[in-house]
């Protein structure tokens, strides 16, 4: 049966928590990704940014989960207007920022 949106979001949050807590070496070898605007369309924007990181097993599950939230197909090299222009940050910081934002959405009851 389909997973309720609240459960799906909670599972994504749990995965991001696990990534941040289990991080020993620099996440994804310190790869840089585009920073995104967290105010709207966060799932697709996050996926568009993270999909450009390849060969990083630590975030593969996150990429799959974000894909489940994003209603359209996302491929590498694709960028929407939600990207913060010319600002790149490390994947580890991107994950932390995304986690804070998603936890707030969950607490507010915004599951979709």
């Amino acid at each position: 049966s389909p997973v309720p949106p609240s459960t799906a979001l909670k599972e994504l949050i749990e995965e991001l928590v696990n990534i941040t807590q289990n991080q020993k070496a620099p996440l994804c070898n310190g790869s840089m990704v585009w920073s995104i605007n967290l105010t709207a369309g966060v799932y697709c924007a996050a996926l568009e940014s993270l999909i450009n990181v390849s060969g990083c097993s630590a975030i593969e599950k996150t990429q799959r989960m974000l894909n489940g939230f994003c209603p359209h197909k996302v491929s590498a090299g694709q960028f929407s207007s939600l990207r913060v222009r010319d600002t790149k940050i490390e994947v580890a910081q991107f994950v932390k920022d995304l986690l804070v934002h998603l936890k707030k959405l969950f607490r507010e009851g915004q599951f979709n």
Epitope: T7, K10, E14, V17, Q21, K103, K104, R107, G109
Partner: antibody, heavy 123, light 107 residues
Framework: EVTLRESGPGLVKPTQTLTLTCTLY??????????VDWIRQPPGKGLEWLAH???????RYNPALKSRLTISKDTSKNQVVLKLTSVDPVDTATYYC???????????????WGQGTLVTVSS | DIQMTQSPSSLSASVGDRVTISCRAS??????LNWYQQKPGKAPKLLIF???MKPRGVPSRFSGSGSGTDYTLTISSLQPEDIATYYC?????????FGGGTKVEIK
């Protein structure tokens, strides 16, 4: 030491508004990941969750009572206030406030409780 | 809302007995299950959170287990000070909901 202390009127008449205050000691509701819940327990009965407020002012209510409840915080006084409108004798209960901490995963577990304040609704 | 059903509603056991209390959720709560102990005339006290985690100061005789919809609180060796009502609570989905309670008495 973390403690919470509820205060209330003790006796309220039907149709009136009940105002309860929870004063927090040993922690601050301005600290990230802190939350405060209100729970009530009618005499001889079980526990019912009423409302929750997070450090960043995100508020959630029990849908069964949402239209009658308002939760707010005063960070400067380190207090959380709960208002319940249009009270009825069935609202007679001991009202507890409790602390929730959500570090990492978001789970709601109330790790410290106040001693409770008994509120009787009667004319 | 998620319904929480506790069993038994009351039990009587001897000092030193192993006691188990069950809690069933109406849907999967993914281990977000807490247990509270409430002694007569007192506020509830957190005993177990996230199915099996214990706050500091909780005696080792208390343990929690379970997954999905079914959870258990175990007191490995009942002590006189354990006379109380025990409540389960799901912390997965709002509104938060509690079981009806299990009253534990000494024979």
């Amino acid at each position: 030491e973390v403690t919470l202390r509820e205060s209330g009127p003790g006796l309220v008449k039907p149709t009136q508004t009940l105002t309860l205050t929870c004063t927090l000691y040993g922690f601050s509701l301005s600290t990230s990941d802190m939350g405060v819940d209100w729970i009530r327990q009618p005499p001889g009965k079980g526990l019912e969750w009423l409302a929750h407020i997070w450090w960043d002012d995100v508020k959630r209510y029990n849908p069964a009572l949402k239209s009658r409840l308002t939760i707010s915080k005063d960070t400067s006084k380190n207090q959380v206030v709960l208002k319940l409108t249009s009270v009825d004798p069935v609202d007679t209960a001991t009202y507890y406030c409790a602390r929730t901490v959500s570090s990492g995963y978001i789970y709601y577990a109330m790790d410290y409780w106040g001693q409770g304040t008994l509120v009787t609704v009667s004319s | 809302d998620i319904q929480m059903t506790q069993s038994p509603s009351s039990l009587s056991a001897s000092v030193g007995d192993r006691v188990t209390i069950s809690c069933r959720a109406s849907q999967d709560i993914r281990n977000y299950l807490n247990w509270y102990q409430q002694k007569p005339g007192k506020a509830p006290k957190l005993l177990i959170f996230y199915t099996s985690m214990k706050p500091r100061g909780v005696p080792s005789r208390f343990s929690g287990s379970g997954s999905g919809t079914d959870y258990t609180l175990t007191i490995s060796s009942l002590q006189p000070e354990d006379i109380a009502t025990y409540y389960c609570q799901q912390g997965n989905t709002l509104p938060l909901t509690f079981g009806g309670g299990t009253k534990v008495e000494i024979k």
